[in-house]
Amino acid sequence: SDKLYQRKEPVISSVHTKVKGIAEVTENVTEGGVTKLGHSIFDTADYTFPLQGNSFFVMTNYVKSEGQVQTLCPEYPRRGAQCSSDRRCKKGWMDPQSKGIQTGRCVPYDKTRKTCEVSAWCPTEEEKEAPRPALLRSAENFTVLIKNNIHFPGHNYTTRNILPTMNGSCTFHKTWDPQCSIFRLGDIFQEAGENFTEVAVQGGIMGIEIYWDCNLDSWSHHCRPRYSFRRLDDKNMDESFVPGYNFRYAKYYKENNVEKRTLIKAFGIRFDILVFGTGGKF
Amino acid sequence: SDKLYQRKEPVISSVHTKVKGIAEVTENVTEGGVTKLGHSIFDTADYTFPLQGNSFFVMTNYVKSEGQVQTLCPEYPRRGAQCSSDRRCKKGWMDPQSKGIQTGRCVPYDKTRKTCEVSAWCPTEEEKEAPRPALLRSAENFTVLIKNNIHFPGHNYTTRNILPTMNGSCTFHKTWDPQCSIFRLGDIFQEAGENFTEVAVQGGIMGIEIYWDCNLDSWSHHCRPRYSFRRLDDKNMDESFVPGYNFRYAKYYKENNVEKRTLIKAFGIRFDILVFGTGGKF
Amino acid sequence: SDKLYQRKEPVISSVHTKVKGIAEVTENVTEGGVTKLGHSIFDTADYTFPLQGNSFFVMTNYVKSEGQVQTLCPEYPRRGAQCSSDRRCKKGWMDPQSKGIQTGRCVPYDKTRKTCEVSAWCPTEEEKEAPRPALLRSAENFTVLIKNNIHFPGHNYTTRNILPTMNGSCTFHKTWDPQCSIFRLGDIFQEAGENFTEVAVQGGIMGIEIYWDCNLDSWSHHCRPRYSFRRLDDKNMDESFVPGYNFRYAKYYKENNVEKRTLIKAFGIRFDILVFGTGGKF
């Protein structure tokens, strides 16, 4: 609460996160023209990336384009991309939606459709829907440990959210354990009124707000964090503004002296840890 | 404008960026002693990296050192690095400018020059100028979509820069479309009074400032962002303080059971999105 | 100092860091059943990662699990993980400490011990201590150049920590050169009252605070940074809360058409650059 006689100072914060959990993923795998069910295990090194402290990412879904090579090929026949003659294809043109640079030729994509030929990583990425349900939907049961060190330099005061008395096998709960800093991802979503299973398909951004309202006067000292959660991406966003949260990255390799890559379109939850608050002292 | 009767609160912000664009790169490629012109396509997975929300990087230039192996070799004969006898080479010495640890021997680098032998990734990186013009100079035409969610917790008010009424095919313009949040990289530079083609060679840091000056009183409510742009790195910086913006990263692989790497010195623009402002309410 | 007649404004900051240094690492390497001493050189591309401006990471130690494949194998016999019959193993169970999903079978781990079989990246990671002394303990002699651009938009004032008069071969010293922005990592630790050699084993988080107390009135203008250092992770942290600083990442490759990975558990120092302060003007 506001104490007008106090000198207020904003918090200086550092965050460290640690995600735990394993996901079993079942998907169709095609090898040598034969499609069969494949099972694989994803651990932290597979589904998360070494990001900075105040943000961490958990991959919940993906689409792979394997064995791409830099060459010429027909572009993917998305809406409005088909052609019937070379006139429709403009040499040197880069359609922002396309994945390559047009050569000016209209070529067969398959039996029935023709598209403009492009110089690109081929075959170009198919614009297919993210798998539903999400491949790593079990990430709902992953946990994240959040360590937060705060400082009020003007008051020469430092503290952290984890106290020596805390129990490392706790799980945060708004009522039963509001000071525990180990959070189940599914619980974070529930607290924010969101459905993890749904968001996991396209990805999203979730805010974990840590509010420090610190009274640093010795006679009524109080300085503990309050956690709250809210979704940061717009779930009602128009298609043209790229709903959800995804990014593409590539694994490069050489095969028979040919430079190739596997392109991964990774959908997932980016968790932003937003630390704010003030320290007040007479 | 300052309303002294209002309670002011700083903004809590989360940012999400999405870069679009393809670059065609033409460079000399040497294979089996033969040098020829090579053309390649770079898409987002090739020129950008999954970074946090408030920063994104676009590679505009690079220098590659291919097929490096951990072994002994003569160091690169940069200014002041040549030797004429072993006396000039100190076993175990690591010159901060060098790329390895000296063995104490002075060995031939080429027909005319001798340098200290080092234990390093060999052959050591040549200290050659960044290509001019920049290899991905066409990145000037890439676009970035910036999504910004803001929150004034004390006023329990949340909003975002993208409104449902907005058009996903717009491009930001200071006069004609100042609320559009899709920015052409070249336009950002032009607004900041900088030359993209020039900065692309050595790299640089560009600030995109988003200023929220929010009046949250119901009778005169206003809360929309104002965008401005300024260069953050020092273009007049002395050579010793590393002008521009670059970093090195490596791609590791095995060839005939020998651990090798390709070292990439990536030059580019780091865009920092700096969100600030206040929300005021009676 | 507080000048009550001034209008104060918080700093808007952008940071760029550049680490320099080479480490020679000596470790036991096992090949074809024979263990011998291996020497290798680590440069910036090997021990650091392209992170954002306000944070950088230097790897000081590591544990490798090479040639992992997705298959079935006995889990690592850590404390409490051994079994004597299948009853102790629960099909589909994922122990948060384990690295896989139990099949329900109790199988031999070695001559004397049995553990639950798991579907995982195999062989599973051994829970061995981080090497002591740290493999890259010589990182103590690495240096980091910190470039900091600051802005007070309300006062339309911009400056940076590096002035044209500065010497690029300086090293920060609290007394002799407090404005030099090139820092030896070991010195940072010494200033913070910490032992680099010790922290390098398990990793840690170190704060570099840059304080700008700017008087922007023309008659008594002053705006230069003050650097201070403090450890941000809790060195007395309970084992259950993951002391130190480490993360796992993987290098994926194919061998004889089998997808494999090398898992690296990287320990190191994350340096957080915390910029704060105000600009005051009448």
């Epitope: 030729r105 070529v107 067969p108 | - | -």
Partner: nanobody
Framework: EVQLVESGGGLVQAGGSLRLSCAAS?????MGWFRQAPGKEREFVAG????????RYADSVKGRFTISRDNAKSTVSLQMSGLKPEDTAIYYC???????????WGQGTQVTVSS
Amino acid sequence: EVQLVESGGGLVQAGGSLRLSCAASERTYSMGWFRQAPGKEREFVAGSGWDGIPTRYADSVKGRFTISRDNAKSTVSLQMSGLKPEDTAIYYCATGTSVYHYQYWGQGTQVTVSS
């Protein structure tokens, strides 16, 4: 699924020539040839994009083999000259989405080069 029928295989002396042909049941962006020698894996030989652009050859056949195609007829042929005993294999016609990527294969035709 695309149907592919190869023809033109046979026995030939080292240094001789042979022409393989392949007809596809429908038009396709790229057509190419692979081969498999006894006890070895199937390997790429030559490929051609639409209208013969681009073409790609394995290093071992460069300068000796020439691929050509007729889009109108959905056919591809492989002119092989300067044949060597190590060219002995079953040759397969294939179609795909680029000169590096093939999805459909023919039944194959035997080529034997005697020394």
